[in-house]
């Protein structure tokens, strides 16, 4: 399988609203025109698929309607946003990139982004 380098940040802190964003960058060896991006979560040595999208270069990146992910693409970069995160979702989020067309097929897997999610403290009741 032809390998491809994928870069992503080591650590990202989710916002208080449970939103985390990071960039996944791949070094395309050719004229990649159709790309599949998959976000995997690794926790306790288990890997699960968080979301995936296939896009043509120059077209928008569309995840399924019920996906917790959104994203945009620009050149060889994909800007990924994961929403609805809670403290229990803290873990290593791995970016997997496949160059689907034209041939040959290439696969690249990033080292992962450790996303830390801190549940917000409940607001104390206040008297005015």
């Amino acid at each position: 399988c032809k390998a491809m380098h994928v870069a992503q940040p080591a650590v990202v802190l989710a916002s208080s609203r449970g939103i985390a964003s990071f960039v996944c960058e791949y070094a395309s060896p050719g004229k990649a025109t159709e790309v599949r991006v998959t976000v995997l979560r690794q926790a306790d040595s288990q890997v699960t698929e968080v979301c995936a999208a296939t896009y043509m270069m120059g077209n928008e990146l569309t995840f399924l309607d019920d996906s917790i992910c959104t994203g945009t693409s620009s050149g060889n970069q994909v800007n990924l946003t994961i929403q609805g995160l809670r403290a229990m979702d803290t873990g290593l989020y791995i970016c997997k990139v496949e160059l689907m067309y034209p041939p040959p097929y290439y696969l690249g897997i990033g080292n992962g982004t450790q996303i830390y999610v801190i549940d917000p403290e409940p607001c104390p009741d206040s008297d005015f």
Partner: antibody
Framework: QVQLVQSGAEVKKPGASVKVSCKAS????????INWVKQAPGQGLEWIGD????????NSNQKFEGRVTLTVDTSISTAYMELSRLRSDDTAVYYC?????????????WGQGTLVTVSS | DIVMTQSPLSLPVTPGEPASISCRSS???????????LYWYLQKPGQSPQLLIY???NLASGVPDRFSGSGSGTDFTLKISRVEAEDVGVYYC?????????FGGGTKVEIK
């Protein structure tokens, strides 16, 4: 339903250029690559190249490189193949075909073909 | 370029009888991702080619199940369990493991 409708037959002189059109309907034009394939009389199929309608990015067979230009006009959902410096062995039927990712980029719909005759 | 070689060149068939076409590639079309990048197309007389099989063994939508595809990395077979008159035409195998995409020379199936 999905349709690819190509322009009519052309007769050209050697050294001239020809531009074949392929109008797509029945699907979102920018969601699929368009391929071009040559079939010389009584012969098999030969891949010329492909184009991504979103950004005009192309890949082409080295055999045709330098003589073939693939373009699109997304406003009218039409792909074009222009072949320059025509020779007698360019006499052929030229097909456009849509690629389908669900079929791992097989050509699932084809135009009816355009016969290009190169003769002096 | 990957060379696709088909045999036989011509195949006379009897309606209701089975038929088999072979295709060989100069390089394995089985990728390490588990996908075999081999396709079959049929060009009926006076028509454009149509997709029959993708990924070596998967039938395209609307293709009758009397057609089936099988093979290894370099040797492939298209089988028609019971030939019908409408199956006549030229059958092409093709690969898209690498650019340029290449086709076999074709096998002409005709009724005896």
């Amino acid at each position: 339903q999905v349709q690819l409708v190509q322009s009519g037959a052309e007769v050209k002189k050697p050294g001239a250029s020809v531009k074949v059109s392929c109008k797509a309907s029945g699907y979102k034009f920018t969601d699929h690559f368009i391929n071009w394939v040559k079939q010389a009389p009584g012969q098999g199929l030969e891949w010329i190249g492909d184009i991504n309608p979103n950004n005009g990015g192309t890949n082409s067979n080295q055999k045709f490189e330098g003589r073939v230009t693939l373009t699109v006009d997304t406003s009218i959902s039409t792909a074009y193949m222009e072949l320059s410096r025509l020779r007698s062995d360019d006499t052929a039927v030229y097909y456009c075909a849509r690629l389908r990712r669900e079929y791992f980029y097989a050509m699932d719909y084809w135009g009816q073909g355009t016969l290009v005759t190169v003769s002096s | 370029d990957i060379v696709m070689t088909q045999s036989p060149l011509s195949l006379p068939v009897t309606p209701g009888e089975p038929a088999s076409i072979s295709c060989r590639s100069s390089k394995s079309l089985l990728h390490s991702n588990g996908i075999t990048y081999l396709y079959w197309y049929l060009q009926k007389p006076g028509q454009s080619p149509q997709l029959l099989i993708y990924q070596m063994s998967n039938l395209a939508s609307g293709v009758p199940d009397r057609f089936s595809g099988s093979g290894s990395g370099t040797d492939f077979t298209l089988k028609i369990s019971r030939v019908e008159a409408e199956d006549v035409g030229v059958y092409y195998c093709a690969q898209n493991l690498e650019l340029p995409l290449t086709f076999g020379g074709g096998t002409k199936v005709e009724i005896k």
